[in-house]
C-alpha cells in the first residue's frame, strides 16, 4: 500500500516557540520515491503566501525521509508568523499545512515588568 505520492509531513496546528537572536532551522519533512521534488518555503501574509526566495535553505537526507530546511541565522522578531512549504512534482503542486513560529524578543521580554511587579506597582503600566 506504499504510495509514491510526494508527502509533506507538517501537521495541522504545528508550532514552534523560539527566541530572537538564536539560530533556528525550520524543517519540512518530505517523502518522495525517485526524483526529489522542487520544494520552496513561503510566509503567510493574510490569505497569500509570499515565497521566500532570498533566504538560505538546504536539504538534509536521511534513510527514509528528507528535510528541506529554512535557516534563520539568527531569528529576528519579525520572523514571527506562519510558514508553509510546497513541493512541485510532475507539474503537481503539493502544499503543506502551515506551521507557526512564535518569536520571543529576549530584549523586550527582559525589559518588560513581571506580573508580580505590575500587581504591586501598578504605576509601571503607565511608564
Amino acid at each position: 500500500k506504499e504510495s509514491c505520492d510526494v508527502q509533506l509531513y507538517i501537521k495541522r496546528q504545528s508550532e514552534h516557540s523560539i527566541l530572537a537572536g538564536d539560530p533556528f532551522e525550520l524543517e519540512c519533512p518530505v517523502k518522495y520515491c525517485a526524483n526529489r521534488p522542487h520544494v520552496t518555503w513561503c510566509k503567510l501574509n493574510g490569505t497569500t503566501c509570499v515565497k521566500l526566495e532570498d533566504r538560505q535553505t538546504s536539504w538534509k537526507e536521511e534513510k527514509n525521509i528528507s528535510f528541506f530546511i529554512l535557516h534563520f541565522e539568527p531569528v529576528l522578531p519579525n520572523d514571527n508568523g506562519s510558514y508553509r512549504c510546497s513541493a512541485n512534482f510532475q507539474s503537481n503542486l503539493i502544499e503543506s499545512h502551515s506551521t507557526t513560529l512564535y518569536v520571543t524578543d529576549v530584549k523586550s521580554a527582559s525589559e518588560r515588568p513581571s506580573k508580580d511587579e505590575m500587581a504591586s506597582r501598578p504605576w509601571l503600566l503607565y511608564r
Epitope: 509531513y9 501537521k11 525521509i65 499545512h97
Partner: antibody, heavy 121, light 112 residues
Framework: QVTLKESGPGILQPSQTLSLTCSFS??????????VSWIRQPSGKGLEWLAH???????RFNPSLKSRLSISKDTSNNQVFLKITTVDTADTATYYC?????????????WGQGTTLTVSS | DVVMTQSPLTLSVTIGQPASISCKST???????????LNWLLQRPGQSPKSLIY???KLDSGVPDRFTGSGSGTDFTLKISRVEAEDLGVYYC?????????FGGGTKLEIK
Amino acid sequence: QVTLKESGPGILQPSQTLSLTCSFSGFSLSTFGMGVSWIRQPSGKGLEWLAHIYWDDDKRFNPSLKSRLSISKDTSNNQVFLKITTVDTADTATYYCARGNWDGETYFDYWGQGTTLTVSS
Amino acid sequence: DVVMTQSPLTLSVTIGQPASISCKSTQSLLDSDGKTYLNWLLQRPGQSPKSLIYLVSKLDSGVPDRFTGSGSGTDFTLKISRVEAEDLGVYYCWQGTHFPWTFGGGTKLEIK
C-alpha cells in the same frame, strides 16, 4: 499485515480512571506520517473521536473531553495508551484504536476490534 | 465543532441495484493546503469500522471499484454502482479538516 488490538478493564465504577491499551503490529509509530487515534462508540450509536498521537509524540484531543484525557505511546513495544479520569455512565461504550495513515493529513485506514467498557455502580 | 449530517438514515436496496448516500458538513472541508479531508467508513454488523474512501474519492486498498466518492466544499456523496450482499452495514462519513475530527450519524444499508 497491519493489526491493532485494544484491551481494557471491561467494567468500572463511576469516578474511577479508565486505562486502555492498544497493541499493534505491521507498522512503526516512529515512521513519519503514522499515528494512532482512540475513537469510541456507545452501543447502537455513532462514533466519537477522542484523541490522537503522532509519530513525533505530538498529541491532539477532543476539546469536549480534553481535561479528562491523556494519551501516550511506547514505540519500542508498539503500544498506545489512553487514560480517561473520573468515568461516568456516559462513558459506557466500545473503544476502538485506529491507525492514522497520512495523505496530507491523517485518515484511519485500519481499526482494532474494539474493547467494551461498562460503567456501573 | 463541524457537524456531519448523513441522509438517508436507512437505505433499502436490492442486490445488483445502485445506492447513494449523502453527507453534508456545517463548514467547508476544503483545507488551506488545497485538499479536502472527507472520508468514508463501513461498519458491518458486529464488526469494527473499515476504511473505504479518503480524500473524498481515493479508494483505500482492497476496496472494490463499485464504490465511488465525490463532492466538494460541504456536500459529498458515496455511490455504490451495484450493491452486493457484503455491502450491508452502517456507512459513516467523517472529516479530518477541522479539529476535533467528527463523524456523521451513519446510514444503514439494508438488503431488500
